[in-house]
């Protein structure tokens, strides 16, 4: 759920880490309504989700991880 | 250690609704999602959907929007399933599991011992 | 949503034998694809996760191997106590979905 590149809302769908290639921060203070991680999947998707739940939580640490480590 | 304590065996009538618990020890109940499984002779295992406790969020098979709502109670460390307008399709074996992160992957780890639902008249 | 297709549907060999269990998805699910093991009347149990890793306390003899849309499971040097239904299970998006299930018997 995304409009003029602000989520308006959240997936009720669980990504795997093995489908997501990146992600951006959006930021509730900066022009749009929600706090939102905004995942990129190696098919080429957008897709919104809560930056508080534990499986976006988990992939946020993990890429975050490996882009320390590069 | 983990274990994942479910509620007895449940018989009911066709039209009526149940709701199943299962009660988590030996980890931090909110760092895990709740998935519950549902394991018949025909379909075998089938995945129904998953709660955040921390958030409550929650994930649903389509197949099961309707059918099952998923809550958590942080308090007790419970999760509970409501299944609802029961048929005789919905008897079945009910299972809680916990889903496991680490090394990039997800699993569930652990599982209940499994509920028992019949529906019958 | 994605389908797994899992097979044989059963299976019997003795003991000692090696077996092995395909398991296809409809699309590419890179490697995010588990293994479980159902023994009559107890709970599944995680037998291999992340397509390779063996999860903890399962014997060495099961070994999972794959990448893209093929999957399978090796169980090596049968055992009588090996006997039970095992199910693949796609974890790539929700709905995760299961294997028909493959159910090994001992000749």
């Known amino acids: 759920a995304s409009n003029f590149d602000c989520c308006l809302g959240y997936t009720d769908r669980i990504l795997h880490p093995k489908f997501i290639v990146g992600f951006t921060r959006q930021l509730a203070n900066e022009g749009c309504d929600i706090n939102a991680i905004i995942f990129h999947t190696k098919k080429k998707l957008s897709v919104c989700a809560n930056p508080k739940q534990t499986w976006v939580k988990y992939i946020v640490r993990l890429l975050s991880k490996k882009v320390k480590n590069m | 250690q983990v274990q994942l304590q479910q509620s007895g065996a449940e018989l009911v009538r066709p039209g009526a609704s149940v709701t199943l618990s299962c009660k988590a020890s030996?980890?931090?109940?909110?760092?895990?999602?709740m998935h519950w499984v549902k394991q018949t002779p025909v379909h075998g295992l089938e995945w129904i959907g998953a709660?955040?406790?921390?958030?409550?969020?929650?994930a649903y098979n389509q197949k099961f929007k309707g059918k099952a709502t998923l809550t958590a109670d942080k308090s007790s460390s419970t999760a509970y399933m409501e299944l609802r307008s029961l048929t005789s399709e919905d008897s079945a074996v009910y299972y809680c599991t916990k889903c496991y992160y680490g090394s990039a992957d997800y699993a569930m780890d652990y599982w209940g011992q499994g509920t028992s639902v019949t529906v019958s008249s | 949503d994605i389908q797994m297709t899992q097979s044989p549907a059963s299976l019997s060999a003795s003991v000692g034998e090696t077996v092995t269990i395909t398991c296809g998805a409809s699309e590419n699910i890179y490697g995010a694809l588990n293994w479980y093991q159902r023994k009559q009347g107890k709970s599944p149990q995680l037998l291999i996760y992340?397509?390779?890793n063996l999860a903890d306390g399962m014997s060495s003899r099961f070994s999972g191997s794959g990448s893209g849309r093929q999957y399978s499971l090796k169980i090596s040097s049968l055992h009588p106590d090996d006997v039970a239904t095992y199910y693949c299970?796609?974890?790539?998006?929700?709905?995760?979905?299961f294997g028909g299930g493959t159910k090994l018997e001992i000749k």
């Open positions: 299970q796609n974890v790539l998006s929700t709905p995760w979905t």
């Open positions: 030996g980890y931090t109940f909110t760092d895990y999602e």
């Open positions: 709660i955040d406790p921390e958030t409550t969020s929650t």
């Open positions: 992340g397509a390779t």
